[in-house]
Interface confidence: low
């Protein structure tokens, strides 16, 4: 049928398809209207009446044009290691991202199931590879002539200061101590501090229930620091 005269519901031409934002209802055998984002199908269409849409209830949403009988439940509230970067609305799910200093240890479709704290390199070890949204910090022992005296997820091994006269030689976890004044510092530009990675992974992408009316639950997975590896905290 020409678009100008086809009002839903209508029977499609043999072998034809329904238009954009319409769907074919198998029961009515008609092209019927989809519901817009933020709504769902309260009453399905018949041969003589179109789809009746209704707004999604609190804590539920639909992101696309649809004909679902119930809106999807927004994901659970963000866990303590995450921040909410997108609120639950009738048209979009809540998005949780790992907070600074954390990374997504267990990812899932379009999101993060589990945030974990970035490993901290203990004294004597420095950051070999900084953490990212989805990977932990890698620590390495400080090489001769370098040291790290901090427990940090961002500090790299720094060169010992160069003394005119050395009072105490430096080691992997301690800088050299000079007897003379005005020691010189041998340091590569920008070698001291790596910026904290910014996490942008989302958490619950799936709907999560809401009672009495909507569906249920959430996964606030317990999160702890990674087990100590060589070069991590926990001597």
């Amino acid at each position: 049928l020409p678009a100008q005269v086809a009002f839903t519901p209508y029977a499609p031409e043999p072998g034809g398809t329904c238009r954009l934002r319409e769907y074919y209802d198998q029961t009515a055998q008609m092209c019927c209207s989809k519901c817009p984002p933020g709504q769902h199908a309260k009453v399905f269409c018949t041969k003589t009446s179109d789809t009746v849409c209704d707004s999604c209830e609190d804590s539920t949403y639909t992101q696309l044009w649809n004909w679902v009988p119930e809106c999807l439940s927004c994901g659970s509230r963000c866990s303590s290691d995450q921040v909410e970067t997108q609120a639950c609305t009738r048209e979009q799910n809540r998005i949780c991202t790992c907070r600074p200093g954390w990374y997504c240890a267990l990812s899932k479709q379009e999101g993060c199931r589990l945030c974990a704290q970035l490993r901290k390199c203990r004294p004597g070890f420095g950051v070999a590879r900084p953490g990212t949204e989805t990977s932990d910090v890698v620590c390495k022992p400080c090489a001769p002539g370098t040291f790290s005296n901090t427990t940090s997820s961002t500090d790299i091994c720094r060169p010992h200061q160069i003394c005119h006269v050395v009072a105490i030689p430096g080691n992997a976890s301690m800088d050299a101590v000079c007897t003379s004044t005005s020691p010189t510092r041998s340091m590569a530009p920008g070698a001291v501090h790596l910026p904290q990675p910014v996490s942008t992974r989302s958490q619950h992408t799936q709907p999560t229930p809401a009672p009495s009316t909507a569906p249920g639950t959430s996964f606030l997975l317990p999160v702890g620091p990674s087990p100590p590896a060589e070069g991590s905290t926990g001597d």
């Epitope: 609190d58 009988p69 119930e70 509230r77 709907p207 229930p209 249920g216 959430s218 996964f219």
Partner: antibody, heavy 121, light 111 residues
Framework: EVQLQQSGTVLARPGASVKMSCKTS????????MHWVKQRPGQGLEWIGT????????SYNQKFKGKAKLTAVTSASTAYMELNSLTNEDSAVFYC??????????????WGQGTTLTVSS | DIVMTQSPASLAVSLGQRATISCKAS??????????LNWYQQKPGQPPKLLIY???NLPSGIPARFSGSGSGTDFTLNIHPVEEEDAATYYC?????????FGGGTKLEIK
Amino acid sequence: EVQLQQSGTVLARPGASVKMSCKTSGYTFTSYWMHWVKQRPGQGLEWIGTIYPGNSDTSYNQKFKGKAKLTAVTSASTAYMELNSLTNEDSAVFYCTRENLLLRSYFFDYWGQGTTLTVSS
Amino acid sequence: DIVMTQSPASLAVSLGQRATISCKASQSVDYDGDSYLNWYQQKPGQPPKLLIYAASNLPSGIPARFSGSGSGTDFTLNIHPVEEEDAATYYCQQSNEDPRTFGGGTKLEIK
């Protein structure tokens, strides 16, 4: 009316695997998390894990990782739990329970009648 | 994991009197001003039944003689006046984080 119907009593040998079911009706199966809870004879309740049938998302109690596997068949509105490498410690009643999320609360509002598992040689 | 400790493990209360059950969490189960703490009743041979959610809310169909209170780590279930049919084991449960954990249960006997 919401109903969760669990499969019947199971007797199994140590080392074997069993798969129990939880058939649901009266609500949209894919919209609610389904949890599984263990109760040993005369003991309290222990949370095993949960599955979201809408996308098969799962979360497990660390204690049951490798022991329990949760699955769901949406076309049958049925959740399943498979337990492997059975020992006497696995003898218990296992409940499936639907969790509801109110805007500011989560709770188990409907429970199956329980499946009794006895592990014995 | 959040450990939920209930006390007493059992108690006997006369018909018409008050039963008080305590539940303590090893860490706060509150979030943004709400308590993620539920109470369930279980009778022998039956699955648990939701009694109270969010510390103090009664689902429809639960008699008003059941009440819950508390926040943070300390919660209380009160039953008053106790009736014969209240003989059961009562469990508290936190839903603030996974793994969900239950208290050890309190067995209530009616004298």
